[in-house]
Amino acid sequence: KSSNEATNITPKHNMKAFLDELKAENIKKFLYNFTQIPHLAGTEQNFQLAKQIQSQWKEFGLDSVELAHYDVLLSYPNKTHPNYISIINEDGNEIFNTSLFEPPPPGYENVSDIVPPFSAFSPQGMPEGDLVYVNYARTEDFFKLERDMKINCSGKIVIARYGKVFRGNKVKNAQLAGAKGVILYSDPADYFAPGVKSYPDGWNLPGGGVQRGNILNLNGAGDPLTPGYPANEYAYRRGIAEAVGLPSIPVHPIGYYDAQKLLEKMGGSAPPDSSWRGSLKVPYNVGPGFTGNFSTQKVKMHIHSTNEVTRIYNVIGTLRGAVEPDRYVILGGHRDSWVFGGIDPQSGAAVVHEIVRSFGTLKKEGWRPRRTILFASWDAEEFGLLGSTEWAEENSRLLQERGVAYINADSSIEGNYTLRVDCTPLMYSLVHNLTKELKSPDEGFEGKSLYESWTKKSPSPEFSGMPRISKLGSGNDFEVFFQRLGIASGRARYTKNWETNKFSGYPLYHSVYETYELVEKFYDPMFKYHLTVAQVRGGMVFELANSIVLPFDCRDYAVVLRKYADKIYSISMKHPQEMKTYSVSFDSLFSAVKNFTEIASKFSERLQDFDKSNPIVLRMMNDQLMFLERAFIDPLGLPDRPFYRHVIYAPSSHNKYAGESFPGIYDALFDIESKVDPSKAWGEVKRQIYVAAFTVQAAAETLSEVA
């Protein structure tokens, strides 16, 4: 059957009609509407927004729009017993206290229910002790402290600057180092770009601004009390002691005004090198403890937050496919915010809203996509990707059989310099082809394609004339679809110039100052970057849902597999003596990659030549493409991370935000020289090479001729 069944629009016109219907002015209106009050997960305000979105998606023309609710573990500050940090003197008197809230931005002074800065899921506690400054609290920072500087963090309160890695990894590292509390702060070196004013006069972080965020180490588990299964009405919940990923020590975030007061008194060891110095006028001494005059003073944390099982609501909209209704292309982004969500998530949610409206307009004109499109407004992303993960757990059997692709739609912007894309290699060609057809919104690129401006501003480090596309890591709602279920996934947003702006993320991330005005005044007054992101995300969904042959190129997977094999081999070869002693061979992996490359090449040739008018053969070839990502899933998961099951990609064990290739081998090799039993450690390296080689070979065979 034709892909235009039940349509009255020609195929070429379809995509153009869809893209032409997307309007910057609508995205602007939707963003304003979504950002006037806080929409914290588990609150009445966020439930009301869910119902509003449900109603509007129905009006836009979707076939059905349902709320899917779950009862998950969330975390809130105690309203009557605020969290703060003190400096106490030898008598125990509090001689300095950190602020209890961020000064509200202009126009928002009377808004209620602004949650004060807190580290979600911190346990309660009032530890007191000496401070140790641990830089970014990365694995390598603790190696420097413990191994090189011989500084012991056991029984200390550590203070770490935000940035570089996911905050949950910082807390995990501090726990492993024996710390009894963690203070997180935003250093101007990372969150204040030179030459830009602080909010409300610019997009920089003021001294009283604080980054909220969860500090879990869930490793893909979803709700901490129901790992692997949906948190539904009849769920069996673990006790809090058995919950997944909860921190064991109190944690609290502060701004740089308060951090100055703590850091200016630091004594002990000097910073090991300039990479440990931020931009505050303090020595950045490591400690432990305060300098001479203040050596009897200590730091005390007061944390009274509570963990509570709370109802959350996803909105799931369906646009039924005309030809293959049992094949799902999913566009999803979260709705919950820490406060107003001016960028995170509502700049993304507004784009999804406009994409739904455009699809709905086409549907009202008689068009349908070839495949079913599912639209999702996820809840509780900020509390650990909970809404998306619970829904995927509930629908895992359908998704693993029917899921074609997942496109993520969190923040549309983190800057206004160029496009940023992270996706499966299967989508590289789709993204290249699409961006060649879209107009660049960038100054100086009038009349040029998005592909051209993107490639010029963010070139691929390997291939000249092509743009950089990054690996998927985690820290967003694609995680369960890609890392657990093996559904081809991608994400796109506009980003900053990473060359000139070394700060982490965007300065006002997760603060009260992330408002509509931040976007409208400073980031995207014309909403042209939002429109471009809508065109990229929407265009990807359109092509994935409507092209007769799925727009996946398996040859691009072959190219990256070889690159990743080369990389992990070179890491391993840094230990030549042990490689020789334990006879470590990569032959099986390189051989599997070679086979994959040859089989992928032959499959691509068949894909050009087969009879596309034969629906059985078409479906067969498309299924081979759809299930290729699935073939990289190991049902047993990665060591100690059962919900990270993708053998080629996983979130880095040292930074949830970053993707690691061949993660099983990488983790087996990491810090291997420090392992107490080298024979066992190198045995695990060999086992992981075996698992990787087998998986690549097995994936290759799914692309072979079926009989």
């Epitope: 390997e462 070889r562 690159k563 094999a565 080369d566 990389k567 081999y569 070179s570 391993s572 070869m573 030549p576 042990e578 490689m579 020789k580 002693t581 334990y582 006879s583 470590v584 061979s585 990569f586 032959d587 390189f590 051989s591 990659v593 070679k594």
Partner: nanobody, 113 residues
Framework: QVQLVESGGGLVQPGGSLRLSCAAS????????MSWVRQAPGKGLEWVSS????????YYADSVKGRFTISRDNSKSTLYLQMNSLRAEDTAVYYC??????WGQGTLVTVSS
């Protein structure tokens, strides 16, 4: 069976250059990453450099970065190591290695005035 034969070693003055070669046979050379490893007198094995399937993907130890260049010619099944600005501490037996199992016999490089 896999064979790796190094050549090109010798005596060279500090600041001088040498080009090592490694002729490979017994396997599909282009399908495998390759490495150079060295062993200084009385010391353990030290990884020097690795290369992927083409001359785009290369990796170097910090001690040789900017001075040594690894390359390969897949049509000749040969691996190369161009060594410039040689120092006394580069004196070692240089091995061509496919992985932990397949190594050449090594070629001696002596840097001395």
């Amino acid at each position: 069976q896999v064979q790796l034969v190094e050549s090109g070693g010798g005596l060279v003055q500090p600041g001088g250059s040498l080009r090592l070669s490694c002729a490979a046979s017994g396997f599909t050379f282009s399908s495998y990453a390759m490495s150079w490893v060295r062993q200084a007198p009385g010391k353990g094995l030290e990884w020097v450099s690795s290369i992927g399937d083409n001359n785009r993907t290369t990796y170097y130890a910090d001690s040789v970065k900017g001075r040594f260049t690894i390359s390969r010619d897949n049509s000749k099944s040969t691996l190369y190591l161009q060594m410039n600005s040689l120092r006394a501490e580069d004196t070692a037996v240089y091995y061509c290695a496919k992985d932990g199992v397949h190594w050449g016999q090594g070629t001696l490089v002596t840097v001395s005035s």
